[in-house]
Interface confidence: low
C-alpha cells in the first residue's frame, strides 16, 4: 500500500481542531512582485519580509518595496516600511543579516543615477530601528560581516575598490583599489586579489593575492600569478599559473598564506576548473575538471595538510565552472556524502560514501519500490537522487535533498528507482539511518521540511494548481495526516521554517489571485499542540550509527570510532523541544589499514589495503613542494586519514624513506612575498 495508508497508521488525536487553533493567516497589502524572507538571529522569532514590485514604464522601471517584521515566528507581521523612509530596497543584495545573534541587519537601497554613492539602512536591534547611511561608493556586492566581529564590514565598489567599515557601516574607508575578490578569513583577516594592468578579467592568471590582518593598515602580498583563491576549513587555496604554459595548479597554505605547498593534484588548462566541494578543519574534497567539455571530473580527498590527495571518485558530474554538481553533505550522519556520476553511456547515477570519500557505492533499492523503465534487470537496481543538476534542468524536482544535524540519520530527497536517474516524475524517499536504507515516503514531487529536530516532517505537494492542504508526519515519514489550512486555495511559492529545524512553526507562502489583484499571503502553523508533552527518557532508544553487521565487534566503526545516539522512537508523539541536544556516546575503534591513506609516492593496488611505493617514482626526483622550498620528505608510506580517531590495532610502521626531491614550484615562494604598510 502507499505510504501512510496501511492499517498500522494511527491518527494523531483531534489534530484538526488543534491545528486550526494554531493557524495564523497574514495577508500582505501588496501587489505580487517578489518576496524575500530572512530570519534575524537564532530562537528570536524575528522574521523580516521584503516585498518588491516593479512597474515597467516606457523609459525606466519604477519600483516600490515594503518591509514587514514579525517577532512571533511569522504569526503576525507589522509593516515597518516607514522605518526605511519608504525607500526602494535592492533585492539583488538581499538582506545582509549579521552572524550569530548580533541582531544586525543591512539593507541596500536603490539610488538615483547621478548620486555620489549608495545608501544603506542599518539596524543593530533585530530590525526594531534603522539608521540611514549614505555611502561614499556604489556597492557592487552585499556587505560582508567579519565572522569574528559583526561591527566589521567589507564591500566591493562598482569601481573595484575594497571598502571597510569598523563601526557597522557608519564610516567607510577605501583600503585598496583594483580589487577583484575579497573574503574574510579567521581573526578578522581579509584576503583579496588585485589586478595591475587592465581589469580582473584581463589579468586573470596574473593577479596578486594580498592579506591584511589589521583592516587595511598594513598589507602583505602572499601570492603572485594567481587565477583565483578560496578558503575551506583551515585551508587557504590558490590556483596559480604555471611558468611555461597556460596550465594552473592548486597551492595550499595552512598558516594564512605565509607558507605554501603545491597540492598533489593534476594541473588544469584554460577551459578546466578546480572546485572545493566541502572542507572542514581536517580535510577537503576537491573536484578537478576533466579536459574537454565532458561535464565531469574527479573527486580527490586530501590528507590533514591539504597536500597529498587520494583519488576518491571518477566521472563526477559537474557541468561547468560555477555550474551544477549534486555533491551533498549529509549533515545528519558523520562521514556521509551523496553525489552523481556520469557513466560511460551518458546516464547519471547517484553514489554515496559513508566514510568521507574512502569508498563510494550505489544507494540501496527501497524495499517498497519497483525498478523503473531505466533498469535492465527489474529486480536489481538502485535509488538515484535528484539534486541541483536536476533542478537546473527544470525537471519536476522542487527541492534538493534535506538533512539536519539535530535530526540524526534522517535524509529526505526526490528520487527514482532504476539503473540511473530518470526524467520521469520523481517520488520522495526518506532514509532514517543516514543513507544506508531508503523508503518511499510520498508519491510524486513535494516540498518538505523538518521540524522539532525530526519530531515532525511537513510536506506540500508540488502542483501548478492552487493548494490548501498540508501533510505532516510524526513518525519520520511512515504515516501521514493531511490538514486543510485554508478554505480558499493559494498559489504556493514556498515553505519557510526557522533554520536549524528546532522550531515547531512552519510558514506556507503563496499568493491569491482574483480577476484584478494578486496579494502575498502567509499561513503560519504551530504544531506545539500536536506534540502535547515533552519527550521523556522512555521516548528515546539507543541507535548505533553506521551499523551494518551487529555480529562484528567493529560494527559501526567509521573513521576510527563508533557512535551510539539516543533517538526518538517513531511511535513517540512528543516534543524534543527547542533546547534539544543530540545525545551521543562515542567509542574508539582499533586501527586497521583502512584507517590510513597512502602518502605521496605510494598507492594501493586493487583489492589490497597495503600501500606500496609507486614504481615510476623510484629513483626519480619528486615534483613535490613543501613550504615552497627544497626540502627532504620522510615518510613510511602511510598517513592517518584526517579526523580518524582509531587507536591500537594495526600500526603500519616500516622503514622510513627519505624521499629526496627537487622543488619545481616557486610561484609562491617566500622570496617573492613582500609586505607594506599604508
Amino acid at each position: 500500500s502507499a505510504p501512510g495508508e496501511d492499517e498500522e497508521c494511527g491518527r494523531v488525536r483531534d489534530f484538526v481542531a488543534k491545528l486550526a487553533n494554531n493557524t495564523h493567516q497574514h495577508v500582505f497589502d501588496d501587489l505580487r512582485g517578489s518576496v524575500s524572507l530572512s530570519w534575524v538571529g537564532d530562537s528570536t522569532g524575528v522574521i523580516l519580509v521584503l516585498t518588491t514590485f516593479h512597474v515597467p514604464l516606457v523609459i525606466m522601471t519604477f519600483g516600490q518595496s515594503k518591509l514587514y517584521r514579525s517577532e512571533d515566528y511569522g504569526k503576525n507581521f507589522k509593516d515597518i516600511t516607514d522605518l526605511i523612509n519608504n525607500t526602494f530596497i535592492r533585492t539583488e543584495f538581499g538582506m545582509a543579516i549579521g552572524p550569530e545573534n548580533s541582531g544586525k541587519v543591512v539593507l541596500t537601497a536603490e539610488v538615483s543615477g547621478g548620486s555620489r554613492g549608495g545608501r544603506i539602512f542599518r539596524s543593530s536591534d533585530f530590525a526594531k530601528n534603522f539608521v540611514q547611511t549614505d555611502l561614499p561608493f556604489h556597492p557592487l556586492t552585499q556587505m560582508m560581516y567579519s565572522p569574528q566581529n559583526s561591527d566589521y564590514l567589507l564591500a566591493l565598489s562598482t569601481e573595484n575598490g575594497l571598502w571597510v567599515s569598523k563601526n557597522f557601516g557608519g564610516k567607510w574607508e577605501e583600503i585598496h583599489k583594483a580589487v577583484c575578490l575579497a573574503k574574510w578569513g579567521s581573526d578578522n583577516t581579509i584576503f583579496f586579489t588585485t589586478y595591475a594592468n587592465g581589469s580582473c578579467k584581463a589579468d586573470l592568471g596574473a593577479l596578486e593575492l594580498w592579506r591584511t590582518s589589521d583592516l587595511g593598515k598594513s598589507f602583505k602580498t602572499i601570492g603572485v600569478k594567481i587565477y583565483s583563491f578560496g578558503l575551506g576549513g583551515r585551508f587557504l587555496f590558490a590556483s596559480v599559473m604555471a611558468d611555461k604554459d597556460t596550465t594552473r595548479r592548486i597551492h595550499v597554505s595552512t598558516d594564512q598564506g605565509d607558507t605554501w605547498s603545491m597540492a598533489q593534484l593534476p594541473s588544469v588548462g584554460q577551459e578546466q576548473f578546480y572546485s572545493i566541494l566541502a572542507a572542514n578543519d581536517d580535510m577537503v574534497f576537491m573536484h578537478v575538471d576533466e579536459p574537454g567539455d565532458t561535464g565531469f571530473g574527479t573527486i580527490f580527498t586530501s590528507d590533514d595538510r591539504g597536500i597529498v590527495y587520494s583519488k576518491s571518485l571518477d566521472r563526477h558530474l559537474y557541468t561547468t565552472t560555477g555550474g551544477e554538481t549534486d555533491f551533498t553533505n549529509v549533515t545528519s550522519l558523520r562521514g556521509v556524502y551523496i553525489t552523481s556520476v556520469l557513466s560511460e553511456d551518458n546516464s547519471i547515477q547517484t553514489m554515496i560514501t559513508f566514510d568521507q570519500g574512502g569508498r563510494w557505492t550505489h544507494l540501496r533499492k527501497p524495499e517498497n519500490s519497483e525498478c523503473d523503465a531505466t533498469a535492465k534487470n527489474k529486480n536489481e537496481c538502485s535509488l538515484h537522487i535528484h539534486a541541483s543538476y536536476s533542478i537546473s534542468q527544470k525537471l519536476n524536482v522542487p527541492m534538493a535533498p534535506l538533512s539536519e544535524p539535530n535530526a540524526v540519520g534522517i535524509v529526505i530527497a526526490h528520487g527514482s528507482v532504476g539503473d540511473a536517474i530518470s526524467v520521469m516524475v520523481p517520488d520522495v524517499y526518506i532514509s532514517d539511518d543516514g543513507g544506508y536504507s531508503w523508503t518511499k515516503m510520498l508519491e510524486g514531487p513535494h516540498y518538505y521540511t523538518i521540524l522539532d529536530s525530526g519530531g515532525i516532517i511537513v510536506a506540500i505537494e508540488h502542483s501548478s494548481r492552487p493548494i490548501n492542504v498540508i501533510k505532516f508526519s510524526t513518525d519520520e515519514g511512515q504515516c501521514w495526516q493531511t490538514y486543510t489550512f485554508t478554505r480558499d486555495p493559494i498559489y504556493f511559492t514556498g515553505l519557510a521554517s526557522e533554520p536549524g529545524a528546532r522550531s515547531m512553526n512552519i510558514s506556507i507562502w503563496g499568493f491569491t489571485e482574483s480577476f484584478l489583484t494578486s496579494q502575498w499571503v502567509s499561513y503560519t502553523i504551530d504544531f506545539k499542540d500536536i506534540l502535547e508533552r515533552n519527550c521523556e527518557e522512555k521516548d528515546y532508544t539507543i541507535w548505533l550509527a553506521h551499523s551494518t553487521d551487529p555480529e562484528d565487534y567493529e560494527d559501526g566503526c567509521i573513521l576510527g570510532y563508533k557512535e551510539q545516539f539516543l533517538r526518538l522512537r517513531k511511535s513517540s508523539v512528543c516534543q524534543n523541544g527547542r533546547d534539544y541536544v543530540v545525545t551521543k556516546q562515542p567509542s574508539i575503534c582499533l586501527c586497521s589499514l583502512e584507517d590510513f591513506l597512502c602518502d605521496f609516492g605510494y598507492y594501493r593496488p586493487e583489492n589490497d589495503s597495503k600501500c606500496v611505493e609507486q614504481p615510476e617514482l623510484k629513483g626519480h626526483d619528486l615534483e613535490f613542494c613543501l613550504y615552497g622550498r627544497e626540502e627532504h620528505l620522510t615518510t613510511n608510506g602511510y598517513r592517518k586519514i584526517p579526523g580518524d580517531k582509531c587507536q591500537g590495532g594495526v600500526n603500519p610502521v616500516r622503514e622510513v624513506k627519505d624521499l629526496k626531491k627537487k622543488c619545481t614550484s616557486n610561484f609562491l615562494s617566500p622570496e617573492k612575498q613582500n609586505s607594506k604598510s599604508n
Epitope: N346, I348, Q393, L395, D419, V423, M424, H462, S464
Partner: antibody, heavy 129, light 107 residues
Framework: QVQLVQSGAEVKKPGASVKVSCKAS????????MSWVRQAPGQGLEWMGI????????SYARKFQGRVTMTRDTSTGTVYMELSSLRSEDTAVYYC??????????????????????WGQGTTVTVSS | EIVMTQSPATLSVSPGERATLSCRAS??????LAWYQQKPGQAPRLLIY???TRATGIPARFSGSGSGTEFTLTISSLQSEDFAVYYC?????????FGGGTKVEIK
Amino acid sequence: QVQLVQSGAEVKKPGASVKVSCKASGYTFTKYYMSWVRQAPGQGLEWMGIINPIGGSTSYARKFQGRVTMTRDTSTGTVYMELSSLRSEDTAVYYCARDPSGIAAAYPASRYNYGMDVWGQGTTVTVSS
Amino acid sequence: EIVMTQSPATLSVSPGERATLSCRASQSVSSNLAWYQQKPGQAPRLLIYGASTRATGIPARFSGSGSGTEFTLTISSLQSEDFAVYYCQQARLGPWTFGGGTKVEIK
C-alpha cells in the same frame, strides 16, 4: 496493452474552441508526461506542448501560448487539449503521445530520451465557415 | 528554439537497397534525438530514441547514429513496408521540435 484512445473528429467554425480528449490505459498514468502534436494536411509534425499528469504543470510551444490549454483528470487517466480562437489553418489531425522524455531540458543521457513511444490514433479537427 | 533540418526532402530507393537519411540541429541536442516513421493515414511510430537505440519491436535493419548536431538514420536493406515519411525530433530543450520530414519512395 498500453494504448491512447482519442475522441472523435470535430468540425468547428472560425473563432470557436475545440476540446480533444485522450484516455490512457495499460500503464500508470501519473508516471509519464503527455505531449500533443498536430499535423496539417500534407504537412509535417508540429509539437504543441506537454503536460505533467501529477501536478498538471504544462509547457506550451510559443506559437500556441494563450490559445492552448492542456489539462488532465487523474481519476479517469484522461488528458485534454483545448484550442481556442480557431482559424482555418488549425485544420489538422491532433495526436496525443506518451512522452517519457519529460518537461523542459532532459538529461544528457541517451537512455532516458525515449521519444514519444505511444501515440493516439489522432483526432481530425476541421475549421471551416 | 532548436531548428531541426532534414535532408533530402525526398529519397528514391529501390527495394533491398540502403537508405541514409540526415538530420541536423541548429545547436547541440546531445543524444536526445528520436526518429519516427509515418505511413499515410496512420499515427507516427517511434523507431529510434537516444539517437541510436532501437525502440521495442523495431527491426535491426533500422539504425541511428550521431550526437550533438549531426544525426543519421540508416535503413540497411529497404523492405516494401519501409516506404514512408521519416521525422527526427529533439527533446534536449523545450519546446520539442521536429524536422520537416524525409519521404522515402520506391525508385
